[in-house]
Interface confidence: low
């Protein structure tokens, strides 16, 4: 376990070989989750890229946060996708949090502390526990089948994950840098493996 506080993973160039694999102590399927992270890239007006890829053997897009050029954020659970439109693209560090719960199918998507309109996705679905979680690449099969054209070029950090839906107050606390205790992925106690050309550097956001 590594305390990654105030650090970020840096992917300096496009590739289909560089990625970070995160290890999560999941023992049972997820009926809800929240993922929060920071990222920083210049790619948004150029092409799509993967932000967070959680694959199982059953479904390569079990959870996927992806930037879709000319549209905005693509969020997938169990292979079904919804999009959150972003009309104007700016080059700046971005903080996102997204949550989903099976009981209602409700998806929340927060960008820089501001919520988008809630949407509905995969009501009644269960996210598999035996997962390959990858930063920097989009998995088209369990743990692999990467495409350079979907790779992240830039920085990513503060990746935290919970097995429940955080409240708006909790999301705000996280965005403002307050105390929190993630129970699936914890950036302050991270188990990970780096493959290829990935560097650990001080984070560039506040």
């Amino acid at each position: 376990q590594t305390d990654m506080s105030r650090k970020a993973f840096v992917f300096p160039k496009e590739s289909d070989t560089s990625y970070v694999s995160l290890k999560a102590p999941l023992t049972k399927p997820l009926k809800a989750f929240t993922v929060c992270l920071h990222f920083y890239t210049e790619l948004s007006s150029t092409r799509g890229y993967s932000i967070f890829s959680y694959a199982t053997k059953r479904q390569d897009n079990e959870i996927l946060i992806f930037w879709s050029k000319d549209i905005g954020y693509s969020f997938t659970v169990g292979g079904s996708e919804i999009l959150f439109e972003v009309p104007e693209v700016t080059v700046a560090p971005v903080h996102i949090c997204t949550s989903w719960e099976s009981a209602s199918g409700i998806v929340e998507f927060w960008v820089d502390g501001k919520p988008r309109v809630r949407k509905s996705l995969k009501k009644g679905y269960t996210v598999g526990a035996e997962a390959s979680i990858i930063l920097g690449q989009e998995q088209d099969s369990f743990g692999g089948n990467f495409e350079g054209s979907q790779s992240l070029v830039g920085d990513i950090g503060n990746v935290n994950m919970w097995d429940f839906v955080l409240s708006p107050d909790e999301i705000n606390t996280i965005y403002l840098g307050g105390p929190f205790s993630p129970n699936v992925l914890n950036w302050r106690a991270l188990k990970y493996e780096v493959q290829g050309e990935v560097f650990t550097k001080p984070q560039l956001w506040p």
Epitope: D70, I71, G72, E81, L83, F84, G105, V117, K119, S120
Partner: antibody, heavy 123, light 107 residues
């Protein structure tokens, strides 16, 4: 500029069939979910069918009133949307609009509408 | 299916007046609501999406609001081009049903 142009409407007898087409241009057709919405003369709007994008396995949804009679399909290579209508009833008489989703793939508002094609079911 | 109950069914007003049209959802639709305007012989035109967001090119005299499961479209200082039929539509799951419409006529 987004453009949607419907064709294929006309007069058809009850229990007959008709295939509507919609030619799309001015946007990345293969990215977006597409719909058919209809409006009977002097009546309100009724959503008919949805087909999602390839990334969503071309999933389809139908209104209960047309299920098992209508079939929505698309040809991304030709930027075309279709509605195959079988076993038509008089209550299917309406203006049929080809409608593009906003940015949302599943559940969305409808910012782009074609001008419509009129279907009349009558003996 | 979610039922959208729109009121009033018709409304006769003068240019310059302010009007409010309401739509009530049979269950919580979490602001997943759009408003459309349709003029005689034309296709519907999107006015408001996600309950409160004005679509591109829509004049600022239009505004959307929400209170619980009741959604409102307000038109300030009505112009002659605002007359027509207005529809609400939820987009919270399938099917995305429409309200019955409100006919806005010139007094």
């Amino acid at each position: 500029e987004v453009q949607l142009e419907e064709s294929g409407g006309g007069l058809v007898q009850p229990k007959g069939s008709l295939k509507l087409s919609c030619a799309a241009s001015g946007f990345s057709f293969n990215t977006y979910a597409m719909n058919w919405v209809r409006q009977a003369p002097g009546k309100g709007l009724e959503w008919v069918a949805l087909i999602r994008s390839k990334s969503n396995n071309y999933e389809t949804n139908y209104a209960d009133s047309v299920k098992d009679r209508f079939s929505i399909s698309r040809d991304d290579s030709e930027n075309m949307l279709y509605l195959q209508m079988n076993n038509l009833k008089s209550e299917d008489s309406a203006m049929y609009y080809c409608v593009r989703h906003g940015a949302v793939v599943e559940g969305a508002w409808f910012p782009y509408w074609g001008q419509g094609t009129l279907v009349t079911v009558s003996a | 299916d979610i039922v959208m109950t729109q009121s009033p069914a018709s409304l006769s007003v003068s240019v310059g007046e302010t009007v409010t049209i309401t739509c009530r959802a049979s269950e919580n639709i979490y602001s997943n609501l759009a408003w459309y305007q349709q003029k005689q012989g034309n296709s519907p035109q999107l006015l408001v999406y996600a309950a409160t967001n004005l679509a591109d090119g829509v004049p600022s005299r239009f505004s959307g609001s929400v209170s619980g499961t009741q959604y409102s479209l307000k038109i300030n200082s009505l112009q002659s081009e605002d007359f027509g039929i207005y529809y609400c539509q939820h987009f919270w799951g399938s099917p995305p049903t429409f309200g019955g419409g409100t006919k806005l006529e010139i007094k």
